[in-house]
């Protein structure tokens, strides 16, 4: 049975600033014709037929659901992209994470300006402080890592706070073994 294709993002963040670039790639096994990819944005068929969809100088209208399809194979699971206009943006490698999988958080400044004196918060409590900005890296996510995250920091010596972001860590499905 042909596998469903999977949409991946590069850079890996699904929350980006207006004006930034992101490439969506339709990955899957045994796809013979690379040029026959269908891309759907908010349910509408895109003109792009390559296995990569480049979003350059992102606009608010680029927000929404993206799916791809190779040949007559099933559509991919949707990926949701959000385009923001703000000073600080908390980005996550995924908003729904399987237990045991890694999770990365990034406090990102508009125009790539340096953010410093950065504090990451989870459920209103400070998690980490860095004078110079660093990503938060959770190598093995657990259900306890679920929560509402945000970050604060200085850009040009001015204080800013990101919008909150809900992260959900779900339990990995148990394998079922059947005795024969």
């Amino acid at each position: 049975v042909p596998q469903k294709p999977k949409v991946s993002l590069n850079p890996p963040w699904n929350r980006i600033f207006k004006g930034e670039n992101v490439t969506l790639t339709c990955n899957g096994n045994n796809f013979f014709e690379v040029s026959s990819t269908k891309w759907f944005h908010n349910g509408s068929l895109s003109e792009e037929t390559n296995s990569s969809l480049n979003i350059v100088n992102a606009k608010f209208e680029d927000s929404g659901e993206y799916k791809c399809q190779h040949q007559q194979v099933n559509e991919s699971e949707p990926v949701y992209l959000e385009v923001f206009s703000d000073w600080l943006l908390l980005q996550a490698s995924a908003e729904v994470v399987m237990e045991g999988q890694p999770l990365f958080l990034r406090c990102h400044g508009w125009r790539n300006w340096d953010v410093y004196k950065v504090i990451y918060y989870k459920d209103g409590e400070a998690l980490k402080y860095w004078y110079e900005n660093h990503n938060i890296s959770i190598t093995n996510a657990t259900v306890e890592d679920s929560g509402t995250y945000y970050c604060t920091g200085k850009v040009w010596q001015l204080d800013y706070e990101s919008e909150p972001l809900n992260i959900t860590v779900i339990k990995a499905p148990r394998e079922k073994y059947w005795l024969q």
């Epitope: 125009r111 300006w113 953010v115 410093y116 004078y131 850009v155 040009w156 010596q157 001015l158």
Partner: antibody, heavy 121, light 110 residues
Framework: EVQLVESGAEVKKPGSSVKVSCKAS????????ISWVRQAPGQGLEWMGR????????NYAQKFQGRVTITADKSTSTAYMELSSLRSEDTAVYYC??????????????WGQGTTVTVSS | QSVLTQPPSASGTPGQRVTISCSGS????????VNWYQQLPGAAPKLLIY???QRPSGVPDRFSGSKSGTSASLAISGLQSEDEADYYC???????????FGTGTKVTVL
């Protein structure tokens, strides 16, 4: 390479105002901040304030609050510093300087040539 | 009144090492990066060291910066006659919400 060119020397009467300009060339004006620094004869450097053109935000040293106004015209890549209610102690060389776009260390890496302002009755 | 304190003068013979100190507080040096500027006679200041220890391109490696707590230092090793200038430390000050310069140090090459 970014260059900052300031307007010419000024002689002003006490109580009047002076407006000094600083034109940037060779870089993206919106990507950085412009600071104004002054130096009285034989004295040290004194930060007056700064503007971040793309944000339209200016802030000033407490000493000059209410007397200085820093503005920027993005269309001409020019920053301005206006100092009002001039007194003899304002006689100084006024420098504009580019603040490096990587904001956390606030380093002024390009400077104008300086504008001499003399306040005398 | 400057909030960063430097010695008014320092001197050395060619080839010697000269160190300039800069003393501040938790609201400036203690919590922010330190920059150093060189001002040659009759010229505009020039950035010499940024982010405590970094040298912009074109600045000779005989200039080095350091920071510890609420103090910073600039060292000039292998002093040369063209190093004769005024040197200023500077830092953002959180309590003043502004940038502050040191009092300045005049370096003389004997």
């Amino acid at each position: 390479e970014v260059q900052l060119v300031e307007s010419g020397a000024e002689v002003k009467k006490p109580g009047s105002s002076v407006k000094v300009s600083c034109k940037a060339s060779g870089g993206t004006f919106s990507s950085y901040a412009i600071s104004w620094v002054r130096q009285a004869p034989g004295q040290g450097l004194e930060w007056m304030g700064r503007i971040i053109p793309i944000l339209g935000i200016a802030n000033y040293a407490q000493k000059f609050q209410g007397r200085v106004t820093i503005t920027a015209d993005k269309s001409t890549s020019t920053a301005y510093m206006e100092l009002s209610s001039l007194r003899s102690e304002d006689t100084a060389v006024y420098y504009c300087a580019r603040v490096n776009p990587f904001g956390y260390y606030y380093a002024m890496d390009v400077w104008g040539q300086g504008t001499t302002v003399t306040v005398s009755s | 009144q400057s909030v960063l304190t430097q010695p008014p003068s320092a001197s050395g013979t060619p080839g010697q090492r000269v160190t300039i100190s800069c003393s501040g507080s938790t609201s400036n040096i203690g919590g922010n990066s330190v920059n150093w500027y060189q001002q040659l006679p009759g010229a505009a200041p020039k950035l010499l060291i940024y982010a405590n220890i970094q040298r912009p391109s074109g600045v000779p490696d005989r200039f080095s910066g350091s920071k510890s707590g609420t103090s910073a230092s600039l060292a000039i090793s292998g002093l040369q006659s063209e190093d004769e200038a005024d040197y200023y430390c500077a830092s953002w000050d959180d309590s003043r919400n502004g940038y502050v310069f040191g009092t300045g140090t005049k370096v003389t090459v004997l």
